[in-house]
């Protein structure tokens, strides 16, 4: 029986040219994680983290994707084309496959600075990464 829970970064926005953490976390299961796949909205693989072999970043993303923190990915030098869905797929034994979804919206710098739609009060942040000023969650 699959008892696990996947938590994700959720819906986030980030500034063009900046970076963002894509993160998933599997809990509530004793299953062993054998591999984590990271896919983009068009189903192309960004990276794979195999429990035995470690990380493999696909050539098309080598310059802009850094492994970690943890089993997550850091997407750098963001472009408007990076807007869209991202998926983490946890391959586990004996449970099987768990899948999490993240939606990233990349904003033009001026929009990111001034758009009220994504602004969260400075003491009301619900994200955590290396440059919190430029990353916002929206529901």
């Amino acid at each position: 029986m699959m008892t696990g829970t996947i938590e994700t970064t959720g819906n986030i926005s980030a500034k063009k040219g900046g970076s963002v953490i894509l993160q998933c976390h599997l809990s509530s299961t004793m299953a062993q994680v054998t591999q984590v796949n990271w896919e983009q909205h068009d189903h192309s693989l960004l990276a794979i983290r195999n429990a035995e072999l470690g990380w493999h970043i696909y050539p098309a993303f080598k310059d802009r994707v850094a492994p970690g923190p943890g089993l997550g990915l850091t997407l750098q030098s963001l472009t408007m084309n990076d807007t869209g869905e991202y998926f983490c797929t946890y391959h586990t034994y004996p449970d099987g496959t768990y899948r999490g979804r993240i939606f990233l919206e990349v904003l033009e710098s001026s929009v990111a600075e001034h758009s009220a739609r994504f602004q969260i009060p400075i003491e009301g942040r619900d994200y955590k990464d290396d440059d919190d000023k430029h990353h916002h969650h929206h529901h």
Partner: antibody, heavy 123, light 112 residues
């Protein structure tokens, strides 16, 4: 096995300084944000400060802002709290705590706590 | 900042009887990933706090199934189906959605 061991507490006069340390082991230290939480006499748990996995994001409770400084050394798997201009109301048992989820999701709570180090501020 | 309000602050219970603690947040704890970030902690006398329940209703590893959590948005409840002597201590709810993190005032469970 995850372990968090605090040290550095003691008796100090008001206005003086103290530096707390927390030595961590048993998990990928540089993938998680860490916190300081305190338990004062006759009071409940009070959150003090948080530092992100790479020190890029730091937050403090209003009660300690401008007086306390949180830092970490990922090479040494260590967390610190520099406490300046101490007040009697800072008297408490100080715990370091590990976030439950790795960087990028949200605070998500604390799955492991240290045993605490006692800070007593008195003249 | 999010304010957490717990009730009751004191809870005398007879062993074997059920117990319930309420927790209310001043704003929604719903994250964009669909989860409500509400935790319950228990601090037993002379011990370090321990995580009991996270994401409103998920029991932490090793927590007995007599503990259960429920609720959504701003109203949450911790239930103990049958209180045991070892449950004595202070129960705290905490919002884990954002900083500054905030705890409820704590509910002291005592055995009658």
């Amino acid at each position: 096995e995850v372990q968090l061991v605090e040290s550095g507490g003691g008796l100090v006069q008001p206005g003086r300084s103290l530096r707390l340390s927390c030595a961590a082991s048993g998990f990928t230290f540089d993938a998680y944000a860490l916190h300081w939480v305190r338990l004062g006499p006759g009071r409940g748990l009070e959150w003090v400060s948080r530092i992100s996995w790479n020190s890029g994001s730091i937050d403090y409770a209003d009660s300690v802002k401008g007086r306390f400084t949180i830092s970490r050394d990922n090479a040494k798997n260590s967390l610190y709290l520099q406490m300046n201009s101490l007040r009697t109301e800072d008297t408490a048992l100080y715990y370091c705590a590990k976030e439950r989820t790795p960087a990028g999701i949200t605070v998500a709570g604390f799955d492991f706590w240290g045993q605490g180090t006692l800070v007593t501020v008195s003249s | 900042d999010i304010v957490m309000t717990q009730s009751p602050l004191s809870l005398p219970v007879t062993p074997g009887e059920p117990a319930s603690i309420s927790c209310r947040s001043s704003q929604s704890l719903l994250h964009s990933n669909g989860f409500n970030y509400l935790d319950w902690y228990l601090q037993k006398p002379g011990q370090t706090p321990q995580l009991l329940i996270y994401l409103v209703s998920t029991r932490a590893s090793g927590v007995p199934d007599r503990f259960s959590g429920s609720g959504s948005g701003t109203d949450f409840t911790l239930k103990i189906s049958r209180v045991e002597a070892e449950d004595v201590g202070v129960f705290y709810c905490m919002q884990a959605l954002q900083t500054p993190c905030s705890f409820g005032q704590g509910t002291k469970l005592e055995i009658k």
